[in-house]
């Protein structure tokens, strides 16, 4: 059954002068045998023999899509007129990387537009780009199979000191952004409250400047700055942070009232609203979602709700008046 019912009307294709009724009469056993579909493709209206003038449609397996003209036409000489058609992968396969590298998120297939982040064990950095995006059927930039981890010069320099510092005799002093940061270090997305702007900075430079008491610099996320939810949240959390009573150093970052420093990754991870402790006098009057009623929440609850990207309007600081 076809919604485009064929009552034998003489059709003319865009690129044909001949009407189907003008095709020569054929004997019953003539026609075309089943054509060979492209790799990762199949014939939708499959049968043993096709009549002259008959079309077959090429479809692709899940995860592939047709590129080119997807119809073959049976010709009087028993051959097929076929344009260039192929089934191209619409997903990227999980790349094969050296065992030392960790892929996040770890999936078998990735859709076009999805990105992965490659990370190394503590004290090591990826010797090359760390972020890759699935485009068409391949990764951009291409992932070299020799890509590996290298010793993080930051870790080497710092000795027993904190990040952004270096050992000088028996004491720790701030690294110089100019002198100590000529080596490669991973990119960070950083916000400068003075210029009210965000930019990509090498980790070494960011940590050295932060150590030199540049309090206006805020870590947003690992990797170069890219528009999206991560950047959006990074900027919002920077605004909220000024009222946080907790400021706990954590890797490149500082964790606030609504966060916990993950011991295994040295990253600040948002708590979930039920994990918030009631204490604290940093209160906000808010409106949740499409609700009209007002609610008093503490800064931890506000931070966790916004981090989870749930709709919430902050009406004013302090308790709701009603």
């Amino acid at each position: 059954f076809s919604i485009m019912e064929n009552n034998g009307q003489p059709c003319i294709n865009d690129d044909e002068e001949m009407k189907e009724v003008d095709l020569p009469e054929i004997e019953a056993d003539s026609g075309c045998p089943q054509p060979v579909p492209p790799e990762n493709g199949f014939i939708r209206n499959e049968k043993q023999l096709y009549l002259v003038g008959e079309d077959v449609e090429i479809s692709c397996l899940t995860g592939f899509e047709t590129v080119g003209y997807q119809y073959f036409r049976c010709l009087p000489d028993g051959t097929w007129r076929q344009g260039d058609v192929e089934c191209q992968r619409t997903e990227c396969i999980k790349p094969v990387v050296q065992e030392v590298l960790t892929i996040t998120p770890f999936q078998r297939l990735y859709r076009i537009g999805e990105s992965i982040e490659l990370t190394c064990p503590k004290g090591f950095v990826v010797a090359g780009p760390s972020r890759y995006t699935c485009q068409g059927n391949s990764w951009t930039p291409p992932i070299s199979n020799s890509l590996t981890c290298e010793k993080d010069t930051l870790t080497k320099l710092k000795g027993h000191c904190q990040l952004g510092q270096k050992q000088s005799g028996s004491e720790c002093i701030c690294m110089s952004p100019e002198e100590d940061c000529s080596h490669h270090s991973e990119d960070l997305c950083v916000f400068d409250t003075d210029s009210n702007d965000y930019f990509t900075s090498p980790a070494c430079k960011f940590l050295a400047e932060k150590c030199l008491n540049n309090q206006q610099l805020h870590f947003l996320h690992i990797g170069s700055c890219q528009d999206g939810r991560q950047l959006e949240w990074g900027l919002e959390r920077t605004r909220l942070s000024s009222n946080s009573t907790k400021k706990e150093s954590c890797g490149y970052d500082t964790c606030y009232d609504w966060e916990k420093c993950s011991a295994s990754t040295s990253k600040c991870v948002c708590l979930l609203p039920p994990q918030c402790f009631k204490g604290g006098n940093q209160l906000y009057c808010v409106k949740m979602g499409s609700s009209t009623s007002e609610k008093t929440l503490n800064i931890c609850e506000v931070g966790t709700i916004r981090c989870a990207n749930r709709k919430m309007e902050i009406l004013h600081p302090g308790k709701c008046l009603a």
Epitope: H221, R229, Q230, S262, S264, K267, Q275, F277, N309
Partner: antibody
Framework: EVQLVESDGGLVQPGGSLRLSCAAS????????MAWVRQGPTKGLEWVAT????????YYRESVKGRFTISRDNAKNTLYLQMDSLRAEDTAVYYC???????????WGHGTLVTVSS | DIVLTQTPLTLSVTPGQSVSISCRSS???????????LYWYLQKPGQSPQLLIY???DLGSGVPNRFSGSGSGTDFTLKISRVEAEDVGVYYC?????????FGAGTRLEIK
């Protein structure tokens, strides 16, 4: 030391009601959200409901909405779960749980068995 | 709802052996700001569940460091190096990245 002690459950007929309570000690009860989690013979562990510090916000799993009510009495350091219109599939051990900064369910009570059967 | 599939269902090991338990999610647990809320619990016979691992790989308070967690996206693993007799029970993974919070069906660990 954090302690959570659930009241005795029991056998209830389908359509019947039961109220569970959980006595909390060893921490400032009113400073924490609280939750109920159940463990059924067929469905395994399931989060049931959560309540905020003062009871002004409550959250439920879809299958118990409109039938179960979570509440608390901060003066008595007690958490409650009122279960109405009980069904056979509500048969489970019900645990009272408290979060920490590590997890939503960091501390658990010993559990109480609720059997819904005719 | 997110479905967490644990494998194997049962493990029978001798003390001192290392074992791994897999937890696969029906959807990625990585949220859009880069956080993954995946936990591991152990329920010893006749007891309530106890927290082992939080946020994929962080060790719960008082948990021996022979337990470790790893993974990302949809695939997670709990590893116990050098199993001890006291490790018997049912191991559950749990996710809180998407509402409602859901648990895996459990993996029973027995000692030979």
């Amino acid at each position: 030391e954090v302690q959570l002690v659930e009241s005795d459950g029991g056998l209830v007929q389908p359509g019947g009601s039961l109220r569970l309570s959980c006595a909390a000690s060893g921490f400032t009860f009113s400073d924490y959200y609280m939750a109920w989690v159940r463990q059924g013979p067929t469905k395994g562990l399931e989060w049931v409901a959560t309540i905020n510090y003062d009871g002004s916000s409550t959250y439920y799993r879809e299958s118990v909405k409109g039938r179960f009510t979570i509440s608390r009495d901060n003066a008595k350091n007690t958490l409650y779960l009122q279960m109405d219109s009980l069904r056979a599939e509500d048969t489970a051990v019900y645990y009272c749980a408290r979060p920490s900064t590590e997890a939503l369910f960091a501390y658990w009570g010993h559990g109480t068995l609720v059997t819904v059967s005719s | 709802d997110i479905v967490l599939t644990q494998t194997p269902l049962t493990l029978s090991v001798t003390p001192g052996q290392s074992v791994s338990i897999s937890c696969r999610s029906s959807q990625s647990l990585l949220n859009d700001v880069g956080n993954t809320y995946l936990y591991w619990y152990l329920q010893k016979p006749g007891q309530s569940p106890q927290l082992l691992i939080y946020l994929v790989s962080d060790l719960g308070s008082g948990v021996p460091n022979r337990f470790s967690g790893s993974g990302s996206g949809t695939d997670f693993t709990l590893k116990i190096s050098r199993v001890e007799a006291e490790d018997v029970g049912v191991y559950y993974c749990m996710q809180a990245s998407h509402a409602p919070y859901t648990f895996g069906a459990g993996t029973r660990l027995e000692i030979k």
